[in-house]
Every structure is written in C-alpha cells, then in structure tokens.
C-alpha cells in the first residue's frame, strides 16, 4: 500500500496504490484511488511507466487522451470511466506481458489539487494446481499439475499424517515449457501414497503461491485448491 | 448517431496504388477513446483487419500488409484514409472502415462498405 | 498471430430453435472476443464484446460465453431476422484476426 500526497498551492490530494502483480497472458489491473471530485471534467488522471517516454494512459475532461501514449501500450489499456467521480483511478490492462512489470506512477490533478502516488507491478504466470491419483503408475501416486507458471517455481509436497517430513525422496518434478517459450508446466508426482490420508502440493515462486490438496479414502476423492498472490496489498 | 461512409474509385488497375476515404459523421474523430480501423473482405470470404489510426496520427498496421499500407487522418474533416500500394487481384474486397473501441477494441459501428475491384 | 475457428461452418435451423455456435482462438485470448452478424450485401453488426456484454440495441435472445481459448454464441429462439452469417473477433493481441463464420440458414 502507497499513500502519496501532492501540494498544489495549499491543496493537496491523497492518491493511494496498491502493489499488485500480472498473470502474463492475461488481464490485469494496475490499482490507484484519489479524493473524489464531483467536477468530472477537472480531473486529470495520467499513468506513468519507469524507464518509459510517453505516457502509459491519459484521462482528461471525461475522456481518454492517448495521444501521447507509448506504442507498448497502444490497445491495451482503459480506465473505469464511470468510477473515476468516485475516485478510481485504477487502469486495465490487456494481455499482460513480461516487460510490463516495473514502477508505475499514478498521477492526479483534480479542482481540489494534485498528487500521486507509485505502484510496484510484477509480472509473471502463476495457476492453480490439479491432484489426481495416477492410476498408471506401478505404485499408488498422486499427480500435481498446474499448466503456467514463470518464473520457476518450487515444489514441495506435505502431508497431515506425515507431517514436517521431507518427500523430495519420493517425489519427481519436471517442466515442461510452453509454447509461447516464456511459461512452463509443472508435474510433481507424488509415489508410495496412502489411503485415509490428505497431501498437500505446494508451488510457490516469488509472484504467487498456490495448494493443491486431496483427501483419499476408500471410498471418495476429496481436492481443494488455493492460490495466494505473494507481496500485494 | 455515429455514421461512417466510404468513398473511392470502385476499380483499379493492377501494380498501382489503391486509396479510399471514410467520413465520419455524427461524432468527432477527436474523440479520444477510438481508434479508426480498416477492415476488408474478399467475396464470399472472411474478414481481415488492415489497421488503425489515432486523431494524433499515429497508427498500426496489419504485419501482413505493413509494406503496401499508409492509413492517415484529417481532422478538420474529420476523414481518415487508406492507401495500399502495388495491388494485384488478390485485393480485390469489400473495404469497409470502422471505429474501434481504444480496448475494448471492438468494431462499432461499420461503414456500408465499397467494392474495389482490381482488374485491368 | 492468433487463429481463430469457428464451427460449424454452416448451421441448419428451423425458427424458434435455439442455435449455439463455436469459436475456438489458437492460444487464450482471456476475454478479448467480439461477435458480429452479417447479412448479405450488408456491413457487419456488433453484437458481442467482451466474450459475453451485449452490445447497445442487441436482442437478450443473444448471449456468448466462454472464456481463453473456447467461445459460444448462443441465439435462444432463432428469429427470421437472425438468418445470417456470424463472426467471432479476438482483441486480445495484434494483428486482430476474424474467423470464417457460420453460416446459420434456414431448415
């Protein structure tokens, strides 16, 4: 969470952003509020990138103004132009990609003053995992997959009766990239399971974390999947 | 409401340089969150973006046309135009303009089109 | 650049019918699809952005679906008006490609 405030004469306004991070491929939204303004057509919204001449988005007397805006950003981005009253300043963007991550820098000027506040953007791919029980194996094994995920990620299996022992043993691991040669998939499988027993597979990179767990019994399978993003907020 | 007419010749000869006009009407071509898209359409055939335009100028293009393709904007007449050079036969089409949405990008609305045909 | 397939080619419908069409993008395109109608001799109509919001003035009995890589449109009860050819558009990335349509004709 950033809180920036900005002087203009003896008005200032608090603009706050939020750390937040983009799955590539898809669409994301960079987060930024700002004191509401009634007044719609004072409000000046631009969206800046570190590194970047141009601007990534521009909002201004109720309408997007892109005609100063960087090529790597041209089609890709809008913002909530029915919220922006109410003080959402955040922007969409499309096809989110590798080289969009970095520092933003939203920036406001309404009729009550200015300000602005930076936002870290990460980039990467990260999805939920599958368990399932691999039935072709020679011995009883569970199957983790989850389809994209960059940068690397680790891999750790856990167990609620075996609990705080060490499965790299008993466990393979691959990945397996992409077609579009940024992204990779990843298969853990998991050997010499038990019954009446709940594992957990557990992948994480510096972006995102996401838990498969599965419950198998004699007579069902239970699976239940999260997935956390890490250092947002 | 918004509307957009094509004008242009209907025929020309092969190895030179096709040009058409849109107008738009109803609305301004200032107006900050479209793009002015190209679209055309071979008979009997699909459809194929040709590129866009921003009221600044600025524009992209279709990679597979880029080499033939000049899209440019007047907005004192509130006009944008399309230029492909080196025709063959292989363009003959109904070319239609559109706005596009600047994202969504969306066509809407569409021109009623105009059939050029490329034969000498 | 994306490809975009759309199925079946043609579709047989008898009037009051419900017709469901297939788009299917190359690689995920989220939900950066548009659908258009076209009759003959006429331009193309937005009916569909955002893989399933109406467009201003279209019919409820439209509606799209689906989401990456696998889209439908949908027509609850076919309307004589409906006889048409229907296009699905990605966004998602440039260049902006189309697919061959569908045909849906009267049974």
């Known amino acids: 969470l950033i809180i920036g405030f900005g002087i203009s004469g003896k008005h200032f306004i608090t603009v706050t952003t939020f750390t937040s991070a983009g799955n590539i491929g898809e669409d994301g939204t960079l987060s930024c509020t700002f004191e509401p303004d009634i007044k719609l057509n004072g409000i000046v919204i631009q969206w800046l990138k570190e590194g970047i001449k141009g601007l990534v988005h521009e909002f201004k007397e109720g309408k997007d103004d892109l005609s100063q805006q960087h090529e790597m950003f041209r089609g890709r981005t809008a913002v909530f132009a029915d919220q922006v009253v109410v003080g959402n300043a955040s922007l969409r963007l499309k096809n989110v990609q590798l080289t969009d991550a970095g520092t933003y820098t939203c920036y406001i000027r309404t009729s009550k003053g200015k300000g602005n506040a930076n936002l870290e953007y990460k980039t990467g791919a990260f999805s939920m995992p599958e368990i399932n029980v691999d039935y072709n194996a020679s011995s009883e094994s569970l199957r983790c997959e989850a389809p994209r995920w960059f940068p690397q990620p680790t891999v750790a299996w856990a167990s609620q009766v075996d609990q705080g022992a060490n499965f790299s043993e008993v466990s393979n691991t691959s990945f397996e990239l992409n077609s579009e040669n940024v992204t990779m998939k990843v298969v853990s499988v998991l050997y010499n399971v038990t019954i009446n027993n709940t594992y957990s597979c557990m992948i994480e990179n510096d972006i995102a974390k996401a838990t498969g767990d599965i419950k198998v019994t004699d007579s069902e399978v239970k699976r239940r999947s999260q997935l956390q993003l890490l250092n947002s907020g | 409401q918004l509307q957009l007419q094509e004008s242009g010749p209907g025929l020309v000869k092969p190895s030179e340089t096709l040009s058409l006009t849109c107008t738009v009407s109803?609305?301004?071509?200032?107006?900050?969150?479209?793009?002015w898209g190209w679209i055309r359409q071979p008979p009997g055939k699909g459809l194929e973006w040709i590129g866009n335009?921003?009221?600044?100028?600025?524009?992209y293009y279709n990679p597979s046309l880029k080499s033939r393709v000049t899209i440019s904007v007047d907005t004192s007449k509130n006009q944008f135009s399309l230029k492909l050079s080196s025709v063959t036969a292989a363009d003959t089409a109904v070319y239609y303009c559109?706005?596009?949405?600047?994202?969504?990008?969306?066509?809407?609305?569409w021109g009623q089109g105009i059939l050029v045909t490329v034969s000498s | 650049e994306i490809v975009m397939t759309q199925s079946p080619a043609t579709l047989s419908v008898s009037p009051g019918e419900r017709a469901t069409l297939s788009c299917r993008a190359s690689?995920?395109?989220?939900?950066?699809l548009a659908w258009y109608q076209q009759k003959p001799g006429q331009a193309p109509r937005l009916l569909i952005y955002?893989?399933?919001t109406r467009a201003t003035g279209i019919p409820a009995r439209f509606s799209g679906s689906g989401s990456g890589t696998e889209f439908t449109l949908t027509i609850s009860s076919l309307q004589s008006e409906d006889f048409a050819v229907y296009y699905c558009?990605?966004?998602?990335?440039?260049?902006?490609?189309f697919g061959g349509g569908t045909k849906v004709e009267i049974k």
């Open positions: 558009q990605q966004y998602h990335s440039f260049p902006f490609t």
């Open positions: 109803g609305g301004s071509i200032k107006s900050g969150s479209y793009y």
């Open positions: 690689q995920s395109v989220s939900s950066n």
């Open positions: 335009i921003y009221y600044s100028g600025s524009t």
């Open positions: 955002g893989a399933s």
């Open positions: 559109a706005r596009e949405g600047s994202y969504p990008n969306q066509f809407d609305p």
